[in-house]
């Protein structure tokens, strides 16, 4: 698949005449069509297998034409062809005077050829223009051709077809020749094949992207090359997946039998002596004054657990020491310091012990605060009223007093004097900045529209049938809305019973 | 079916006049040239003249220039010939043909009217 | 004037090629059209623009038109194609005709 381009660049009719001989009036207004087929030895008009194409009118007897490429437009002309170029062609070129501005064959006059051209020759695909200039006896013609491949197309004849991609199906671009360059980190047939990690052990890892090393199962590794010991071994190692060679000193099936505990985890303290008595088991020798199963008690007067109270005992060079917990003092922690028995939280407070009455929390009524209900809480420190109102502390709560025109827990809420819909009759009501106007409907007028000034239509009653009455107020005249079952003015007919009219 | 049918040939004599008409059916008669083309007995076509589809443009053989007209009626999809001053050799069976447009030449063509101008 | 000329007559047997040819000066920059013309019967077109065939006409009317000569070419020529051909073409505003070609087919 490629295109034809051919690129017209200059026609000259200097006499501005036919093919005929007969001078187009007032000039020739001269359009092309373009014809191109397969090889012939003599190039005669008839199918052209390969494509046509017709310009606009170009201009008028000689004329250059411009180069429309970059706006999209008609030069060079197009002739696409959807099959392997031959490497050969025949190309047919035809002026035409076109008086109006329809081009079509038949609404041209019967001579309106004004000359005709064709070559023919070998032509291989590539980017660089061949020039050729025809001259019949009175016109000449210079334009150029080349053929290029379409997107995606490649090769000497445009015939392999190459479409860069990067997805599962391949990760490539194109090469000028149409073979598939991989894109960085792809190899293989079609680059489908992603190039593992560097080092990625050949059998124990594979990827499914570039520079990833995935594990097959019983390895690990940055590289694969660990094998998975057996699931639960816990002092052994491996030459093959799933296997569990115990270390040194280590037993048992999961190498978790603990043949040598002294060694592994030292647990006689303070310079003892241990001995291995069997899996998991150890005894510890200890020197003189220290006891425990490990040897790490110290004998000392602490021994004798002086400090009351959950002290803690410190052996010391000329005796011991007691640190008290929270809530207790004295040489052996035996005073207590403050609790709920002693009352102290203020206001009202309730006392809770806590830490087994070592100490108190006080819970405040509201209005206070602090660790024993001492401070006061100020609930207007924070200004909370708007619009200027007035911050008052009222026992365990406060209140704003708002400016007139307010109104709302803070004054947040703008008073309309319309909110009480004070115009009668359908007044409209309009809000001033201090007070309220009222614009009354045809009718009726007074400050609030309370004065009727018009006769109530619907004052003598004129709807039957319980319809309702409405007064047309521009009229002075009423208007009946019959309930569900009466037609008529007043609504005095019932619906399927047609009124005796009396003529 | 595309037609034309000639009528209005006859005898006439030399210095007379004839009109000749070309009824048009099947195809666009107002889009098209149209020609007259005459024979002679036993010669070969001779090209009479030409008219454009709307009528503003007409040709004429050198051998009938100022004798003959051409004209059209698109409303009545008719072609028309005028022959003045006939002579004796104005004889000749007269076809009406529709010109293709760009050169194609005459596709399509009546049957035919035999004018003869003798005395 | 321009003239086309052409051989007063050309003969084949059935089933050869016959060629018949038109000439003027510089024919090959023009348009030519060819007419095949039965005893007593309007011309019928055969080929226009120098080797296109109207729709009906058979494959084997063919033309070709370069340097100073048009030719028309039947191939496997058959009987029912003996009959007048003439060429056509444009000078200046003038429609101009060959003299025509008797086609004699043996």
């Known amino acids: 698949s490629g295109v034809f381009q051919l690129q017209l660049q200059e026609f000259i009719n200097e006499r501005g005449v036919l093919a005929s001989g007969r001078p187009c009036e007032p000039g020739c207004r001269t359009f092309f069509r373009v014809c191109l087929k397969h090889f012939q030895a003599v190039v005669s008009p008839g199918p052209c297998t390969f494509g046509t194409v017709s310009t606009p009118v170009l201009g008028t007897n000689s004329f250059a034409v411009r180069d429309d490429s970059s706006g999209g437009g008609r030069n060079p002309l197009q002739l696409p062809f959807n099959f392997t170029w031959p490497g050969t062609f025949s190309l047919i070129i035809e002026a035409w005077h076109a008086p109006g501005d329809d081009l079509r064959p038949e609404a041209l006059p019967p001579d309106a050829l004004i000359s005709k051209i064709a070559i023919q020759g070998s032509l291989a695909v590539g980017q660089n223009w061949l020039l050729d200039e025809q001259t019949s006896t009175l016109t000449r013609l210079r334009y150029s051709y080349r053929v290029i491949c379409s997107d995606n197309y490649y090769g000497d004849n445009c015939s392999r077809l190459c479409k860069k991609r990067n997805d599962h199906f391949g990760h490539y671009v194109c090469q000028p020749d149409g073979n598939l360059s991989c894109l960085p980190g792809w190899t293989g047939e079609y680059c489908q094949q992603p190039i593992c990690l560097s080092g990625c052990h050949e059998q124990n890892g594979y990827c499914s992207k570039p520079a990833e090393c995935l594990c097959r199962p019983g390895w690990q590794g940055r590289l694969c090359n660990e094998c998975i010991p057996h699931n639960g071994c816990r002092h052994g190692t491996c030459s093959t997946p799933w296997q569990c060679t115990c270390d040194e000193g280590w037993g048992g099936l999961f190498c978790d039998q603990d043949l040598n505990y002294c060694t592994h985890h030292s647990p006689c303290k303070n310079g003892a002596t241990c001995s291995n008595s069997g899996q998991r088991s150890y005894t510890c020798t200890c020197r003189p004054g220290y006891t425990g199963v490990d040897c790490e008690l110290e004998l000392s007067e602490c021994d004798s657990n002086p400090c009351r109270n959950g002290g803690s005992c410190k052996d010391q060079e000329d005796g011991y020491h007691c640190l008290c917990p929270p809530g207790y003092y004295g040489l052996h922690c035996e005073h207590s310091t403050l609790s709920c028995a002693d009352s102290p939280c203020f206001n009202g407070g309730s006392c809770r012990e806590r830490n087994q009455g070592a100490n108190y929390a006080c819970e405040c009524p509201p209005n206070f605060t602090g660790s024993n209900c001492e401070k006061k809480v100020d609930r207007c420190t924070s200004n909370p009223c708007a619009n200027g109102g007035q911050c008052l502390n009222r026992g365990p709560s406060r209140m704003c007093r708002c400016r007139p025109g307010f109104t709302g827990t803070y004054c947040e809420l703008h008073v309309s004097d319309c909110a009480r819909n004070p115009c009668a009759h359908g007044g409209t009501c309009h809000d001033l900045e201090n007070g309220l106007m009222c614009t009354c409907p045809a009718g009726f007028s007074g400050r609030r529209c309370e004065v009727r000034t018009s006769i109530d239509a619907c004052a003598s009653s004129p709807c039957f049938n319980r319809a309702t009455c409405y007064t047309d107020l521009s009229t002075d005249t009423f208007v009946c809305n019959c309930p569900y079952g009466f037609v008529g003015s007043r609504c005095e007919f019932p619906v399927g019973l047609p009124p005796s009219f009396p003529w | 079916e595309v037609q034309l049918v000639e009528s209005g040939g006859g005898l006439v004599q030399p210095g007379g006049s004839l009109r000749l008409s070309c009824a048009a059916s099947?195809?666009?008669?107002?889009?098209?040239?149209m020609s007259w083309v005459r024979q002679a007995p036993g010669k070969g076509l001779e090209w009479v003249a030409m008219?454009?589809?709307?009528?503003?443009?007409?040709y004429y053989a050198d051998s009938v220039k100022g004798r003959f007209t051409i004209s059209r009626d698109n409303s009545k999809n008719t072609l028309y010939l005028q022959l003045n001053s006939l002579r004796a050799e104005d004889t000749a069976v007269y076809y009406c043909?529709?010109?293709?447009?760009?050169?194609?030449?005459?596709?399509?063509w009546g049957q035919g009217t035999m004018v003869t101008v003798s005395s | 004037s321009y003239e086309l000329t052409q051989p007063p007559s050309v003969s084949v047997s059935p089933g050869q090629t016959a060629s018949i040819t038109c000439s003027a000066d510089?024919?090959?920059?023009?348009?030519v059209s060819w007419y095949q013309q039965k005893p007593g019967q309007s011309p019928v077109l055969v080929i226009y623009?120098?080797?296109k065939r109207p729709s009906g006409i058979p494959e084997r009317f063919s033309g070709s038109n370069s340097g100073n000569t048009a030719t028309l070419t039947i191939s496997g020529t058959q009987t029912m194609d003996e009959a007048d051909y003439l060429c056509?073409?444009?000078?200046?505003?003038?429609?101009?005709f060959g003299g025509g070609t008797k086609l004699t087919v043996l």
């Open positions: 099947g195809f666009t008669f107002q889009s098209h040239w």
């Open positions: 623009q120098d080797a």
């Open positions: 008219i454009s589809y709307d009528g503003t443009i007409k």
């Open positions: 056509q073409s444009w000078d200046r505003s003038d429609v101009v």
């Open positions: 510089k024919l090959g920059t023009k348009y």
């Open positions: 043909a529709k010109a293709g447009g760009g050169n194609v030449g005459f596709d399509i």
